[in-house]
Interface confidence: low
């Protein structure tokens, strides 16, 4: 091979020479010289660097602020940031999960299609014919109308998307 004119992966060019980058979890203390390796030091408590780098300072772990409804989902390491999620009943407002809002409830006439998670809101769907929801809820699905026939009853009042059918006794045939 010819003498090098560029550095390879996991190296960086400085003062016309190639130095090894610091591995994830470590920061740069001093560049290499012709006789010495790059000097790196581990990140401190509550700090991280997640790539091969030449950073002189580690990044601070994210703070999951309980005042914003946040809690720690995964504790950070020297190589990874802390991952925040939201308290029960709340979900993140963005992918970065910097704050939380209450889960949406599905109004009467709508049921829960997908229950909310820490990162996604409740997904509601209109109750189709034959189903109803008479409550505002973040958990309840649309319920099927009661089957009067199976109870040997008849429909006295038709159901809607917000109400169940009302069943009653069958009219007796007079002799």
């Amino acid at each position: 091979p010819e003498p090098p004119t560029a550095c390879r992966e996991k190296q960086y060019l400085i003062n016309s020479q190639c130095c090894s980058l610091c591995q994830p979890g470590q920061k740069l203390v001093s560049d290499c010289t012709e006789f010495t390796e790059t000097e790196c030091l581990p990140c401190g408590e509550s700090e991280f660097l997640d790539t091969w780098n030449r950073e002189t300072h580690c990044h601070q772990h994210k703070y999951c602020d309980p005042n914003l409804g946040l809690r720690v989902q995964q504790k950070g390491t020297s190589e990874t940031d802390t991952i925040c999620t939201c308290e029960e009943g709340w979900h993140c407002t963005s992918e970065a999960c910097e704050s939380c809002v209450l889960h949406r409830s599905c109004s009467p006439g709508f049921g829960v299609k997908q229950i909310a998670t820490g990162v996604s809101d409740t997904i509601c769907e209109p109750c189709p014919v034959g189903f109803f929801s008479n409550v505002s809820s973040a958990f309840e699905k649309c319920h099927p109308w009661t089957s009067c026939e199976t109870k040997d009853l008849v429909v006295q009042q038709a159901g809607t998307n917000k109400t169940d059918v009302v069943c009653g006794p069958q009219d007796r045939l007079r002799a």
Partner: antibody
Framework: QVQLVQSGAEVKKPGASVKVSCKAS????????MNWVRQAPGQGLEWMGN????????NYNQKFKGRVTMTTDTSTSTAYMELRSLRSDDTAVYYC????????????WGQGTTVTVSS | DIVMTQTPLSLPVTPGEPASISCRSS???????????LHWYLQKPGQSPQLLIY???NRFFGVPDRFSGSGSGTDFTLKISRVEAEDVGVYYC?????????FGGGTKVEIK
């Protein structure tokens, strides 16, 4: 500190193969090419080739092409040189040597491995 | 292949006196980046070779300043300003600009 520690002496019969190892420590193994140089008894130095442990690319001296294979195991920071179809004139001390990045010279050498080929 | 020719083959020296070794290459060792890829190694008795001078004039880590390299293109010189007893051994010049990298035949430095 940089250290290259080679495997022990070998005695082989003509036609056999030998595989010499070189364990590196004290530096980022994948960042530096590893070279192999041999020295026949009472003779000078002869460059056999080198390997880039990061990509696995090799450069062989044409004289040994087809007979030599250089490999690395990055998990153990070890380089290997295998020489096949040994002849009596392959009797030599075999050295591994690191290629300095900026120096483009062989800055650290192993202690050498004596390979004797004799029937 | 680039042929590296060293002279003399043997060099008897007196401690405290200067010494000089010559090396000639069959092709220029100057790269387009202006570096000259000519190096000097010393092999002390019973030891592995060690790097003394790299890229024509640069002393390697820990090498005493009594060693110096010079030259240009195809003619090179290693000088020892005042030889010491520990300097005995075989000195090799080498090139790393064209594959295969090659070494000179060596110059044996011994105390008179």
């Amino acid at each position: 500190q940089v250290q290259l520690v080679q495997s022990g002496a070998e005695v082989k019969k003509p036609g056999a193969s030998v595989k010499v190892s070189c364990k590196a420590s004290g530096y980022t193994f994948t960042g530096y090419n590893m070279n192999w140089v041999r020295q026949a008894p009472g003779q000078g130095l002869e460059w056999m080739g080198n390997i880039d442990p990061y990509y696995g690319n090799t450069n062989y001296n044409q004289k040994f092409k087809g007979r030599v294979t250089m490999t690395t195991d990055t998990s153990t920071s070890t380089a290997y040189m295998e020489l096949r179809s040994l002849r009596s004139d392959d009797t030599a001390v075999y050295y591994c040597a690191r290629l300095g990045l900026q120096l483009y010279a062989l800055d650290y050498w192993g202690q050498g491995t004596t390979v004797t080929v004799s029937s | 292949d680039i042929v590296m020719t060293q002279t003399p083959l043997s060099l008897p020296v007196t401690p405290g006196e200067p010494a000089s070794i010559s090396c000639r290459s069959s092709q220029s060792l100057v790269h387009s980046n202006a570096n000259t890829y000519l190096h000097w190694y010393l092999q002390k008795p019973g030891q592995s070779p060690q790097l003394l001078i790299y890229k024509l004039t640069n002393r390697f880590f820990g090498v005493p300043d009594r060693f110096s390299g010079s030259g240009s293109g195809t003619d090179f010189t290693l000088k020892i300003s005042r030889v010491e007893a520990e300097d005995v051994g075989v000195y090799y010049c080498s090139q790393s600009i064209h594959v295969p990298w090659t070494f000179g035949g060596g110059t044996k430095v011994e105390i008179k």
